[in-house]
Interface confidence: low
């Protein structure tokens, strides 16, 4: 998977008046990394792992960047003409990625009241607008404003892309990101499904990085895809991930089944509890 940095900024307007604050979150490699504390006017790391990324470095550059971006987005919202009464939001999502082959990607997306209306591929300088007439109107509005602003030139977008990649590389210099390995906690549970059948669920939690193989095996062989149900690999809010796989098997055959897990070059096999034992939990090293 590529390394990525994702900025998510939102500004609000009430009855046509743009509100002073803004909301901002930054995700690093898909994990919540920073957020802007509106009360303190500071960028704050999201959890211990995020603090560890910069070690003893200060968060001033992040604070300045987010503040500047929030200010820009507020000005953009002020130029959207169709602001009716009530609460409205303008959201900007910027993503930059560094792939394994060292190639880079960068994109920018604008949402109004949660609806995508404008996207840009920064490398190709290509803007995309959805078909709806509302999106077309909003996009024209914003594009015109961005064109009027002398700062929003091609150079600006390339600089923005370069800044994003520079920050991403700066974070990746941290051994916390590059060499971070958190082994999964593996739980195997069983529950009654129907007469004569049980559902075996294998859960892996609190692991990093995101890539993991989790499957149910019968007599040491992985079951076919269609006999297993997989959950998404999702952030658990602590800078780590969680996922699960579930399979229906015949009661009494539990000893033939195992949960197989592979992560960061390590692998382990976990038995299915039989009889009254409902949970087997292990944290492998």
């Amino acid at each position: 998977e590529p390394h990525s940095l994702r900025y998510n900024l939102t500004v609000l307007s009430w009855d046509g008046s743009v509100q002073s604050g803004f909301l901002a979150e930054v995700h690093l490699d898909g994990q919540p990394f920073l957020r802007y504390d509106r009360q303190k006017c500071r960028a704050k790391p999201q959890g211990q792992w995020a603090e560890d990324v910069l070690g003893n470095k200060t968060w001033d550059r992040e604070t300045r960047d987010l503040t500047g971006n929030g200010k820009d987005l507020r000005m953009t919202l002020a130029h959207i003409k169709d602001q009716k009464e009530g609460l409205h939001s303008l959201q900007e999502i910027r993503v930059c990625e560094i792939h394994e082959d060292n190639s880079t990607r960068s994109s920018q997306h604008f949402y109004y009241d949660g609806e995508l209306f404008l996207s840009q591929n920064v490398e190709t300088e290509e803007w995309t607008v959805p078909q709806s007439s509302r999106a077309q109107t909003l996009a024209m509005n914003v594009r015109n404003f961005l064109k009027e602003d002398a700062m929003k030139t091609k150079t600006h977008y390339h600089a923005m892309h370069a800044d994003c990649l520079q920050e991403l590389r700066r974070y990746l210099e941290s051994s916390v990101v590059l060499r971070r390995r958190v082994p999964p906690m593996v739980n195997v549970t069983r529950s009654e499904a129907s007469e004569g059948n049980i559902t075996v669920t294998c859960r892996a939690s609190s692991f990093y990085p995101r890539n993991i193989t989790l499957s149910t095996r019968q007599d040491g062989v992985s079951l076919s895809h269609d006999t297993q149900q997989w959950g998404d690999v999702l952030p658990d809010g602590n800078g780590t991930y969680q996922t699960w796989v579930a399979t229906r098997i015949c009661q009494g055959e539990e000893q033939r089944f195992t949960c197989y897990m592979e992560h960061s070059g390590n692998h382990s096999t976990h038995p299915v509890p039989s009889g009254k034992v409902l949970v087997l939990q292990s944290h492998w090293q």
Epitope: K40, C41, R42, G55, N56, K57, T58, D60, R61, T63, R64, Q166, R170
Partner: antibody, heavy 117, light 107 residues
């Protein structure tokens, strides 16, 4: 008017303690990291310590680590520097400084600390 | 700790001259560098932050550039009030460090 005013400087003997204060006004004190910076007579600027806006994190220069303690009281808009086991080389003008947030565009007028027997 | 080395340590120049002071960091600090001016018996004054951003109220004859490890402060046309000591400071990581200073004197 944005202002930082230091106080508490004095002449003390080596090994003794001293507490400096820095009173802030004209800005939202609780939003800013505040630092102590010192300057020995005829010498350059030396950073001493910083305390985060919420008082949680504190960092010190190696030369004062274990001897000096930085603290703040946001309800009083005041920063403190407790200096213990003072040495002759701690003799300096002590400034409190702040800014957006760790490049200092707000400086106090300084308070002189002399460590001498 | 990151070390900052300023050069020259002192220099003599005349009113109207263009002056450049350099600051080299012992490791990369991106653009987390500030420049200060200090006159004898006075408090340091912020000139530049983020390597190249001019502090409000500072004359435009002052400019900063650089990123990574090499930075410069330039005074395009020296004025009588510019004779002072100049310090660079990194705020990329703690401990924050200052350069040893550059004393600018009248020739």
């Amino acid at each position: 008017q944005v202002q930082l005013v230091e106080s508490g400087g004095d002449v003390v003997q080596p090994g003794r303690s001293l507490r400096l204060s820095c009173a802030a006004s004209g800005f939202t004190f609780s939003n800013y990291n505040i630092h102590w910076v010192r300057q020995a007579p005829g010498k350059g600027l030396e950073w001493v310590a910083v305390i985060r806006y919420d008082g949680i994190n504190k960092y010190y220069a190696d030369s004062v680590k274990g001897r000096f303690i930085i603290s703040r009281d946001n309800s009083k808009n005041t920063l403190y520097l407790q200096m213990n086991s003072l040495r002759a080389e701690d003799t300096a003008v002590y400034y409190c400084a702040s800014g957006p947030p760790d490049a200092f565009n707000i400086w106090g007028q300084g308070t002189m600390v002399t460590v001498s027997s | 700790a990151i070390q900052l080395t300023q050069s020259p340590s002192s220099l003599s120049a005349s009113v109207g001259d263009r002056v450049t002071i350099t600051c080299r960091a012992s490791q990369g600090i991106s653009s987390a560098l500030a420049w200060y001016q200090q006159k004898p018996g006075k408090v340091p004054k912020s000139l530049i932050y983020d390597a190249s951003s001019l502090e409000s109220g500072v004359p435009s004859r002052f400019s900063g550039s650089g990123s990574g490890t090499d930075f410069t402060l330039t005074i395009s046309s020296l004025q009588p009030e510019d004779f002072a000591t100049y310090y660079c400071q990194q705020f990329n990581s703690y401990p924050i460090t200052f350069g040893q200073g550059t004393r600018l004197e009248i020739k």
